[in-house]
């Protein structure tokens, strides 16, 4: 039975040209996490692996960059990395956790971080 | 099998700049964060700062900024750090540790820094 | 920054004893908290992450709970290789930081 739970930043918005963290925690659960993958929309961006540390993909070398701890930082945000983003927990044994961040890049500078939210 | 394997005992007067270095082998150094994290004799761990050698990526203590220069050389697997304007202050064992986002997991014997007039 | 607490200080046990530690952030730090050890003139050594998952090579008979804000390392059934210094450390946010450490030493 799963019963851990995954917390999230959720929704949040920054400024184009800034940076912002991407954070998830997975909590009530002594499940082994083996891997965290983190993807937008259907593209992965990045894996920590528990034995391997971490990849970037290519295409995002250069604007991301991992930590802190499973979480992952979005460097010179530009409009077009407004969407959602998810983070995968694999665990061992309770199988997969996922949580969800909605981001706003905006253009001027009323960025708010959004309140923190659970999914269980 | 993962090792970090630390430059030696350092002895500089102040005002000098010492730099030392972190030689990892049995893993891909690319993949993990290198923290540096000093000790003075008889006190708890401080944490300077971190590089990403995957794409040099550098994060800092506030306290050590203009204090600590940290870079890698991905051909030679090697992180460093490079200490400026030492003070008595200064004087700790500094250790070299990786962290793949599962804690940090892998430390290196340290480097002892004497800074003596 | 995030500020961590250890208490106690120093920690007399006789062998055999079972023992908790301590660490309380300034701060929620969900579960991203990681427990070492370091004896007399060694390196730290990782024995717990992320609040509650062992680590390989371990003994079991470390463990460690807590969620938000309190924290807590447990020795069940102390040993005389296990007396040296214990501190927290937090992988929330940066800048990463440290507790100041407790003492465990032999009664």
């Known amino acids: 039975m799963m019963t851990g739970t995954i917390e999230t930043t959720g929704n949040i918005s920054a400024e184009k040209g800034g940076s912002i963290i991407l954070q998830c925690h997975l909590s009530s659960t002594t499940a082994q996490v083996t891997q965290v993958n983190w993807e937008q929309q259907d593209q992965l961006l990045a894996i920590c692996n528990a034995d391997l540390g971490w990849h970037i993909s290519p295409s995002f070398k250069d604007r991301v960059a991992p930590g802190p701890g499973l979480g992952l930082t979005l460097q010179s945000l530009t409009v077009n990395d407004t969407g959602e983003y998810f983070c995968i927990y694999h665990t061992y044994p309770d199988g997969t956790y996922t949580g969800r961040i909605f981001l706003e890049v905006l253009e001027s500078s009323v960025a708010e971080h959004g309140a923190r939210f659970q999914i269980p | 099998e993962v090792q970090l394997q630390q430059s030696g005992t350092v002895l500089a007067r102040p005002g000098a700049s010492v730099k030392m270095s972190c030689k990892a082998s049995g893993y891909s150094i690319t993949s993990y964060w290198m923290h540096w994290v000093k000790q003075r004799p008889g006190q708890g761990l401080e944490w300077i700062g971190g590089v990403y050698p995957g794409n040099s990526n550098t994060n800092y203590n506030q306290k050590f900024k203009g204090k600590a220069k940290l870079t890698a050389v991905t051909s030679a697997s090697t992180a460093y750090m490079e200490l400026s304007s030492l003070t008595n202050e200064d004087s700790a064992v500094y250790y070299c540790?990786?962290?793949?986002?599962?804690?940090?997991?892998?430390w290196g014997q340290g480097t002892s820094v004497t800074v003596s007039s | 920054d995030v500020v961590l607490t250890q208490s106690p200080a120093t920690l007399s046990v006789t062998p055999g004893d079972s023992v908790s530690l301590s660490c309380r952030a300034s701060?929620?730090?969900?579960?991203?908290l990681h427990w070492f050890q370091q004896k007399s003139h060694e390196s730290p050594r990782l024995l717990i992450k992320?609040?509650?998952q062992s680590i390989s090579g371990i003994p079991s008979r470390f463990s460690g709970s807590g969620s938000g804000t309190d924290f807590t390392l447990s020795i069940n059934s102390v040993e005389t290789e296990d007396f040296g210094m214990y501190f927290c450390q937090q992988s929330y946010s940066w800048p990463y930081t440290f507790g100041g450490g407790t003492k465990l030493e032999i009664k």
């Open positions: 540790t990786r962290e793949g986002g599962y804690g940090m997991d892998y």
């Open positions: 992320y609040s509650s």
């Open positions: 701060q929620t730090i969900s579960n991203n």
